[in-house]
Amino acid sequence: ERLPLTPVSLKVSTNSTRQSLHLQWTVHNLPYHQELKMVFQIQISRIETSNVIWVGNYSTTVKWNQVLHWSWESELPLECATHFVRIKSLVDDAKFPEPNFWSNWSSWEEVSVQDSTGQDILFVFPKDKLVEEGTNVTICYVSRNIQNNVSCYLEGKQIHGEQLDPHVTAFNLNSVPFIRNKGTNIYCEASQGNVSEGMKGIVLFVSKVLEEPKDFSCETEDFKTLHCTWDPGTDTALGWSKQPSQSYTLFESFSGEKKLCTHKNWCNWQITQDSQETYNFTLIAENYLRKRSVNILFNLTHRVYLMNPFSVNFENVNATNAIMTWKVHSIRNNFTYLCQIELHGEGKMMQYNVSIKVNGEYFLSELEPATEYMARVRCADASHFWKWSEWSGQNFTTLEAAPSEAPDVWRIVSLEPGNHTVTLFWKPLSKLHANGKILFYNVVVENLDKPSSSELHSIPAPANSTKLILDRCSYQICVIANNSVGASPASVIVISADPENKEVEEERIAGTEGGFSLSWKPQPGDVIGYVVDWCDHTQDVLGDFQWKNVGPNTTSTVISTDAFRPGVRYDFRIYGLSTKRIACLLEKKTGYSQELAPSDNPHVLVDTLTSHSFTLSWKDYSTESQPGFIQGYHVYLKSKARQCHPRFEKAVLSDGSECCKYKIDNPEEKALIVDNLKPESFYEFFITPFTSAGEGPSATFTKVTTPDEHSSM
């Protein structure tokens, strides 16, 4: 019968920081030089031996004379209570198939971590424990005096625990949060009655959870160095270096090389010249509490991130073409680069791709003259595209070209005795058609009745009009815009010898907020188009003169511009242009984009005052310079009489007072006889014009007293 192999020499040591018990023991009576599979059962009690808190089995192969080791981590800080440990064993080896039985228990080993020294009456544990956010933590207090009432607070809020014995209470903190990097404070206060006997506190260091590095990537720009980057996520550093920021290590499995990175989000790896093409990197993030890693496997030639191109230049720049050249940093022989060119100008962007070896060249065509362009280039590995380099760019300006379009020209012809005064207007060419800076305009005036006679007027830019005094002949006028390169096509208009201002009835039109909608009858015969011109009715024509060209098949147009102002009257003239470029006035129109009420009232004179009547007149009142078409006048009359005079009707004024009102519907009727009056009576009147938008401003009434019947005025 075999002897039971009882564990002996059980020794227990502690690690307060880890809250762990470390057991060491040996097995007696083990046959010399023999190995046996054995099972050890371990029992752990707290406070007293009968209070078993943990039982577990540990299986291992045991050699003769071997010292066995096993560790156990306690949730409760070891300082909080005395622990007891014992152990027994069982042979579980195929070499001994007969029924096996457990050995006796070893004697209990008592484990006590004494940190409750000094004259203090209260202790709180654990000291400066480091845990990860979201974990469960157990803390405790030990009170020397069981008469004391002890309250504990986590960040100032009271917590409640479980009494383990009269001196010890434990608190289970579930899923502890990160509060601050200087730790979470917990303190306990012992008191008798209302008198504090003392307070003890601890700092619990809660670390944020270490994240797996994100976006891990490596690339090379020169086949000498790999530049690896990643997003480290949250920094898990704690105050007072209780836990430094997480460290990052690169490990390459093919070479077996390892490098501790000095930056938190990037690391450089030297490429050895041993033609290693494939790399398998593991990036390991590590803090005191855990490790996280992420892996990438790649071929070096597939991870080329080129340095940006350099020496960007432009050669043979003319008005519409240029050659763009650039250089790339050569990184390997027979390397093909794919380059992308972006051309920005005139609000447009063009993109071109080109394959190159060392030096890049691209022919930029169909450019606009006299235009500043920004061209930039970036390159990548053409064989295994990984990513584009940064851009390299430069500005250049194309040369000027002759203006490509004739100026838009119009005129006003006024008849003077014996001649025509022609005021010529032109619009500046758009940038697209000017092809450079316009320096001057040539105006060529040719007498069609005397073909040999012509005059040239050179007008410096930026002038946009000129006045010509011509006799009663027909004239052809050409306007040409000139820049440093050349002249534009000519714009031609013809002034006929016949007076063009034949009587055309002016028609009133109503505008809208959007502008004016105009239509006209087509001109008989061939026309090459129509011109609508307009200006402010009350101003000098030259100040606000505009025109619009309309095609030959169109007999209506909308004139809309922000320049139209409410209360301003605009005059429109519509001309037909014959094939000989002679303008014929077809229609005249006038109107307001928005009518307003009259801005002033007439100055009224009282005439022929008799005992029974008086005459009101306002002959000087101009209906032309008003902010709307005057439609007539309202005459207001007040008297002591209850009834209104014939033709007058009752009205209520804005101040609520009553009076009599007479309406005149003819704006040119500027007088009124008020009769059927009583002698020696007091009357008040007030006259205001009205437009479609309302009456003129309210004003004071004028007083009139009729004389007695015997007086003569």
Epitope: E155, G201, I202
Partner: antibody, heavy 126, light 110 residues
Framework: QVQLVQSGAEVKKPGASVKVSCKAS????????INWVRQATGQGLEWMGW????????GYAQKFQGRVTMTRNTSISTAYMEMSSLRSEDTAVYYC???????????????????WGQGTTVTVSS | QSVLTQPPSASGTPGQRVTISCSGS????????VNWYHQLPGTAPKLLIY???KRPSGVPDRFSGSKSGSSASLAISGLQSEDEADYYC???????????FGGGTKLTVL
């Protein structure tokens, strides 16, 4: 009884240094953190920093970083605050004060100051 | 300029209740406990309230503290002439990594 006794008044020239002592009695010196607070005449209280007498660890207010050093001698239960490069605006009463909680830590946590020294007047004048 | 804001002065008549406010931010009062001190002329400050509303031994229950969000207040009921002193609020500031005080409130008993 529990008390903190500070060294006597000092008069210093601008640019000089001063070292103020604070002797603890009536309690276990290493169990409670020591704070230093100053108060200029007619002004409010200004915290300067802390020292853990057990570990010797210190922490200073940003304003005093590099100019103040807090030390201790546990064998005589005394804390010290030394301030260099003195200026006229450093003229104040300097207090040492014990934290109300005996914190089982090598570091620091502020719970409040329940025992104060009598104060040391430091005058900086040329 | 103090990190915590207190009214410079407060007053009351004997027997009255007086409240002194202390306002801060999320990094100080908003996330830490508050202490109150009082200081008689020519003496060291004395702790009056710790952990928002706890009184050390010897402090009468006429003194009480409270906190709401980023503000705290000290209430003194049954005002007495010996309560005439300077009152300071204090807390830890997570951003500044240090203890901060209010500018102080001078309490006058009329």
């Amino acid at each position: 009884q529990v008390q903190l006794v500070q060294s006597g008044a000092e008069v210093k020239k601008p640019g000089a240094s001063v070292k103020v002592s604070c002797k603890a009695s009536g309690y276990t010196f290493t169990s409670y953190e020591i704070n230093w607070v100053r108060q200029a005449t007619g002004q409010g209280l200004e915290w300067m920093g802390w020292m853990n007498p057990n570990s010797g660890y210190t922490g200073y207010a940003q304003k005093f970083q590099g100019r103040v050093t807090m030390t201790r001698n546990t064998s005589i239960s005394t804390a010290y605050m030394e301030m260099s490069s003195l200026r006229s605006e450093d003229t104040a009463v300097y207090y040492c004060a014990r934290d109300i909680v005996a914190a089982n830590t090598d570091y620091y946590f502020y719970y409040g100051m329940d025992v104060w020294g009598q104060g040391t007047t430091v005058t900086v004048s040329s | 300029q103090s990190v915590l804001t207190q009214p410079p002065s407060a007053s009351g008549t004997p027997g009255q209740r007086v409240t002194i406010s202390c306002s801060g931010s999320n990094s100080n009062i908003g996330s830490n406990t508050v202490n109150w001190y009082h200081q008689l002329p020519g003496t060291a400050p004395k702790l009056l309230i710790y952990n928002i509303n706890k009184r050390p031994s010897g402090v009468p229950d006429r003194f009480s503290g409270s906190k709401s969000g980023s503000s705290a207040s000290l209430a003194i009921s049954g005002l007495q002439s010996e309560d005439e002193a300077d009152y300071y609020c204090s807390t830890w500031d997570d951003s500044l990594d240090g203890v901060v005080f209010g500018g102080g409130t001078k309490l006058t008993v009329l």
